[in-house]
C-alpha cells in the first residue's frame, strides 16, 4: 500500500488516503459515464471479501481498450500483493456470473466506501 499514489508521490501514501483516492476515481467513473462504460463489456462478478482487490483486478484486467478504467486498474494493482495478468482466475470470482463493467464498478464502489467508513484499509 505504501507505493500507491502514483510515481510523482513525494513519499508513502497512508492506506486510508490510497483507499479514498480509489473511491474518488470510481465515483469519477460513475458520474462521468455517458455511453455504456467500456462498451458494455462483461466481467466476472466477485465476492466482496478478503482478497477482493486482487479478484477485482483479475476481473477488470480482462477488459482491454477501455481508457475509462485504466487508472482504476493501476490503482487496484497497488492493493494487490502479487502480479496480475489477463486470464488469471481467482477463487473469489463467482464463476457463473458475469455483469457489466458499470455494475461491477458500482458494486465495488459501494463496498469500498463502507470499508473506508469502518476503517478497514487492508
Amino acid at each position: 500500500l505504501t507505493c500507491l499514489g502514483g510515481f510523482a508521490s513525494p513519499g508513502p501514501v497512508p492506506p486510508s488516503t490510497a483507499l479514498r483516492e480509489l473511491i474518488e476515481e470510481l465515483v469519477n467513473i460513475t458520474q462521468n459515464q455517458k455511453a455504456p462504460l467500456c462498451n458494455g463489456s462483461m466481467v466476472w462478478s466477485i465476492n466482496l471479501t478478503a482478497g477482493m482487490y486482487c479478484a477485482a483486478l483479475e476481473s477488470l484486467i480482462n477488459v482491454s481498450g477501455c481508457s475509462a478504467i485504466e487508472k482504476t486498474q493501476r490503482m487496484l494493482s497497488g492493493f494487490c500483493p502479487h502480479k496480475v495478468s489477463a486470464g488469471q482466475f481467482s477463487s473469489l470470482h463467482v464463476r457463473d456470473t458475469k455483469i457489466e463493467v458499470a455494475q461491477f464498478v458500482k458494486d465495488l464502489l459501494l463496498h469500498l466506501k463502507k470499508l473506508f467508513r469502518e476503517g478497514q484499509f487492508n
Epitope: P14, S16, T17, L19, R20, L48, L110, H111, K113, K114, F116, R117, E118, G119, F121
Partner: antibody
Amino acid sequence: EVQLVESGGGLVQPGGSLRLSCAASGFNIKDTYIHWVRQAPGKGLEWVGRIDPANDNIKYDPKFQGRFTISADNAKNSAYLQMNSLRAEDTAVYYCARSEENWYDFFDYWGQGTLVTVSS
Amino acid sequence: DIQMTQSPSSLSASVGDRVTITCRSSQSIVHSNGNTYLEWYQQKPGKAPKLLIYKVSNRFSGVPSRFSGSGSGTDFTLTISSLQPEDFATYYCFQGSHIPYTFGGGTKVEIK
C-alpha cells in the same frame, strides 16, 4: 422521496419480547447503514446499534448485545429490531435512521419513532 | 466507550442572543480514516432529531448560517449566532467515529 417508517411498538410486560420494523422507501437499504436510536421519556438519545444490510455486518452498543438483535430483509427494504427480556427501563421511543449515501458521514433521515412501553 | 459530555444541560436565552454549547469527548474522536465524525442534532418535543452540523463544522443543507460548529480532538462547540424563536429546542452532540457511537446528554435551550 426518502422515508423511514417504524412500526411494532406498544405495551409489553416485563420479560416479554417485541419486534420493531423500519420500512424504507425512496432508496435501497443495501446502499447505506440503518441505525436504531432510542429515547426514554424525558431523557436523551441513545444509540442502540446499526446494520449494513449489504452484508449483515451488525454492531451494537454492548449494553444491548444479547437482548437486542438487529436484522434486515433486503427484499422488503426493511430493517428490524428484535427486543427480548424487556425491562421497565427499555420504555422509550425507538427511532430508525439511515446514514447518508455518499460517505456515510451522518444520519440524514429519521423515522417518526415508535413508542415501546414496558409495564405490568 | 466514549463519553460525550455536554454543557450546559440547559440554558435560558432571548431572541437575538448568541448561544454557545460545548461538547467534550472522553478521548479523541478522530477516526482511523482521518475524519472526525462529530455531529450536532436539534430535537423538538415529539419529533425526531434533525441534523445541523456534521464532521465538526460542516453545515447540513438547508440549515441556516447562524448555526456553526468548531473544535478538534476532544473539545467541540455549537454556536447559534443570533437565536431565533424556532431555535428553542434540545441540542445533542454525537460521535460516530468509534463504536459504540454515543450522544451527549443534551442541552435544552429555553426562552428567558
